[in-house]
């Protein structure tokens, strides 16, 4: 449909329907995580609230078993925030003990899974060393960007340590996507 | 209008108008804050520049008295960044004095107020412990997500300590929303 | 087209075409940076991958020589994340040596250049003091907001120190924009 900006001004050109309100959209919010088995060297996936409080899925965007299912191909904006909290990191304990000073870290990855290929694709990663001095620390990692997705793709959020995720409030830890 | 993908191919279906350029949008930027009285246990709201520099409101999205007014119902992407800066945090002073090691924190909350409901809703929260060793520290907290809002809803940005907000540059601290 | 919400309900009003799939969009990902000369007091610009992996440009949004070129006027959402990593910051070295405790910092700026105006405009800035205790540190700075751009505007991402940018993975450091 490119080039139509040159259409004569008296000739209105209309778009085949894509009512904005009809586009796939989801905003998922944190719930308490149940410890699940996950492979070594593979970050565990978070599961989410999809219908209570601020959470919703609409227009064929469905949530099932930790995954957001992409119902139609197109460009999506995908975002997530995970708030982490913990006690004094091992890093500072190691430091005090005079041992090598390797920092701990916290990591969030938004991952795409395509059924036709077993290997997930990492779309977004936020990773941060944690070497806090205080006894209790907390901080968010936010991610967001646009990706071309295919119908049937599945999205999930993986974290380096599920036990550090703050699941207490729906505004602190969340995950969403919408078709542009 | 769902299901129209089954319309015969010769029948073009058009969307009732939602010209993208006609959608409510706003990007607000920081101004120097005037100290205001606020209730204990309630974070103060920031006020914003709405028309100078990079700031704008358009298509019936209005800014008044610290609030963005939502002119029509729909799904909005809402975002804010607040840059904080301070001197050595009390946390490190406390640590040096050998007192209990409770970290300070900085927090941003994007809040929705609905006139028909007395209690504000916290849509987004970014909160971070601050336990800096250096004498001067500064850092941003960024938030952004999609929410279903109703005509008449009001949005504001609250912070844990207004005196720590960096109001020096419009690109450091800002608040925006747009109808999807 | 404003005011048409008052049109009688039996009269459908259609939008001049803006098929969503036809809008300018880009998502650029990090590549290894080549050291380039830049003026003192001016942050160097990053260059980007524009066609391999997760990177793309479409619908006349082009990337050339560190710049995203805006092909048509309108409101754009612009975002970037830069992941930084380094060894123990000078700040902590200074601290240990008992010298004045000025923190290092890391900064990301999304800048707009307009050919008709000599001075670049800083649209977004994320800046953070770095005063890490651990020997290796890493952390992302994320930015995103909406801006009114003109056809011919150019966007770039500048950083305080190009040598600290993590260029190892396309999901860690990225830059994008899309017409709303």
């Amino acid at each position: 449909l490119k080039g139509q900006e040159f259409a004569p001004s008296h000739q209105q050109v209309y778009a085949p329907l894509r009512a904005d309100g009809d586009k796939p959209r989801a905003h998922l919010t944190v719930v308490r995580q149940t410890p699940t088995q996950h492979f070594k060297n593979q970050f565990p996936a978070l599961h989410w609230e999809h219908e209570l409080g601020l959470a919703f899925t609409k227009n064929r965007m469905n949530y099932t078993n930790k995954f957001l299912l992409i119902p139609e191909s197109g460009d999506y904006f995908i975002y997530s925030q995970v708030t982490f909290r913990g006690m004094t990191s091992e890093c500072s304990e190691i430091r005090q003990a005079g041992r090598p000073n390797k920092p701990d870290s916290i990591t969030v990855v938004i991952t795409k899974v395509t059924d036709s290929y077993p290997e997930p694709t990492q779309l977004l990663m936020g990773t941060k060393s944690v070497c806090e001095v205080g006894s209790n620390w907390f901080q968010p990692i936010y991610l967001g960007a646009m990706f071309s997705l295919q119908e049937g793709d599945k999205l999930m959020v993986n974290v380096s340590d599920i036990s550090l995720v703050d699941y207490t409030k729906e505004d602190k830890t969340f995950f969403g996507a919408f078709l542009l | 209008l769902k299901g129209q993908e089954f319309a015969p191919s010769h029948q073009q279906v058009y969307a009732p108008l939602r010209a993208d350029g006609d959608k409510p949008r706003a990007h607000l930027t920081v101004v120097r804050q005037t100290p205001t009285q606020h209730f204990k246990n309630q974070f103060p709201a920031l006020h914003w520049e709405h028309e100078l520099g990079l700031a704008f409101t358009k298509n019936r999205m209005n800014y008044t008295n610290k609030f963005l007014l939502i002119p029509e119902s729909g799904d909005y992407f809402i975002y804010s960044q607040v840059t904080f800066r301070g001197m050595t945090s009390e946390c490190s002073e406390i640590r040096q004095a050998g007192r209990p090691n409770k970290p300070d924190s900085i927090t941003v909350v994007i809040t929705k107020v609905t006139d028909s409901y007395p209690e504000p809703t916290q849509l987004l929260m970014g909160t971070k412990s601050v336990c800096e060793v250096g004498s001067n520290w500064f850092q941003p907290i960024y938030l952004g997500a999609m929410f279903s809002l109703q005509e008449g809803d009001k949005l504001m940005v609250n912070v844990s300590d207004i005196s720590l907000v960096d109001y020096t540059k419009e690109d450091k601290t800002f608040f925006g929303a747009f109808l999807l | 087209l404003k005011g048409q919400e008052f049109a009688p309900s039996h009269q459908q009003v259609y939008a001049p075409l803006r098929a969503d799939g036809d809008k300018p969009r880009a998502h650029l990902t990090v590549v290894r940076q080549t050291p380039t000369q830049h003026f003192k007091n001016q942050f160097p610009a990053l260059h980007w991958e524009h066609e391999l992996g997760l990177a793309f440009t479409k619908n006349r949004m082009n990337y050339t020589n560190k710049f995203l070129l805006i092909p048509e006027s309108g409101d754009y959402f612009i975002y970037s994340q830069v992941t930084f990593r380094g060894m123990t910051s000078e700040c902590s070295e200074i601290r240990q040596a008992g010298r004045p405790n000025k923190p290092d910092s890391i900064t990301v700026v999304i800048t707009k250049v307009t050919d008709s105006y000599p001075e670049p405009t800083q649209l977004l800035m994320g800046t953070k003091s770095v005063c890490e205790v651990g020997s290796n540190w890493f952390q992302p700075i994320y930015l995103g907001a909406m801006f009114s751009l003109q056809e011919g505007d150019k966007l770039m991402v500048n950083v305080s120190d190009i040598s600290l940018v993590d260029y190892t993975k396309e999901d860690k450091t990225f830059f994008g924009a899309f017409l709303l």
Epitope: T114, S116, Y117, E119, T121, S148, Q150 | - | V31, R32, T34, E49, E51, L52, G53, L54, A55, F56, T57, K58, E170
Partner: antibody, heavy 119, light 106 residues
Framework: QVQLVQSGAEVKKPGASVKVSCKAS????????MNWVRQAPGQNLEWIGL????????NYNQKFKGRATLTVDTSISTAYMELSRLRSDDTAVYYC????????????WGQGTLVTVSS | EIVLTQSPDFQSVTPKEKVTITCSAS?????MHWYQQKPDQSPKLLIK???KLASGVPSRFSGSGSGTDFTLTINSLEAEDAATYYC?????????FGGGTKVEIK
């Protein structure tokens, strides 16, 4: 293991078109960008263009722009290269070859498809 | 476009001898790769990103260089190394190949 399997040899008349296919297996098809490279008999390698199956984005060598068309069908992990208005000097072996990121080089190559243009 | 000039065009070498092939670019290149092609075979990635050995490539192969001048070295030639070697740049589209260097065993 990774395989790029190309369609068989073709003989075409000048002015005709040819469409060569390349079926990928053993890796994420949308994770790698597909290149097309040709080699005339006894000659050097010549880059025709690329298509990113993830985004559908294409980049053509100006020399082939307007004559070469690169497409993919992600559902069957297959890439296609169509060359139109064939001339006798288009006689060559055509390779599909995939790259992950530009610092990685072209790691995987198809076996090649000989296209002969002759009247 | 960036023109890559390889030299020599042809080299006849005794086994165990050292082979040096150069690739000169008409303008600066960030990403240079080397391929080996044997008769009636597809090219094979040998060296990526100037100096990194591709998977399964023997350590007698090495690469070096920067800017506009790059070198492929075969430290101790073996009979199986008889092939044509190509450099390719991935810095600027179109992603050009060098003219090739044919290495023959004496």
């Amino acid at each position: 293991q990774v395989q790029l399997v190309q369609s068989g040899a073709e003989v075409k008349k000048p002015g005709a078109s040819v469409k060569v296919s390349c079926k990928a297996s053993g890796y994420s098809f949308t994770g790698y960008t597909m290149n097309w490279v040709r080699q005339a008999p006894g000659q050097n390698l010549e880059w025709i263009g690329l298509i990113n199956p993830y985004s559908g984005g294409t980049n053509y060598n100006q020399k082939f722009k307007g004559r070469a068309t690169l497409t993919v069908d992600t559902s069957i992990s297959t890439a296609y290269m169509e060359l139109s208005r064939l001339r006798s000097d288009d006689t060559a072996v055509y390779y599909c070859a995939s790259i992950y990121q530009r610092h990685d080089g072209i790691a995987y190559w198809g076996q090649g498809t000989l296209v002969t243009v002759s009247s | 476009e960036i023109v890559l000039t390889q030299s020599p065009d042809f080299q006849s070498v005794t086994p165990k001898e050292k082979v040096t092939i150069t690739c000169s670019a008409s303008s600066s290149v960030n990403y240079m790769h080397w391929y080996q092609q044997k008769p009636d075979q597809s090219p094979k990635l040998l060296i990526k990103d100037t100096s990194k050995l591709a998977s399964g490539v023997p350590s007698r192969f090495s690469g070096s260089g920067s800017g506009t001048d790059f070198t492929l070295t075969i430290n101790s030639l073996e009979a199986e190394d008889a092939a044509t070697y190509y450099c390719q740049q991935w810095s600027s589209s179109p992603y050009t190949f060098g003219g090739g260097t044919k290495v023959e065993i004496k």
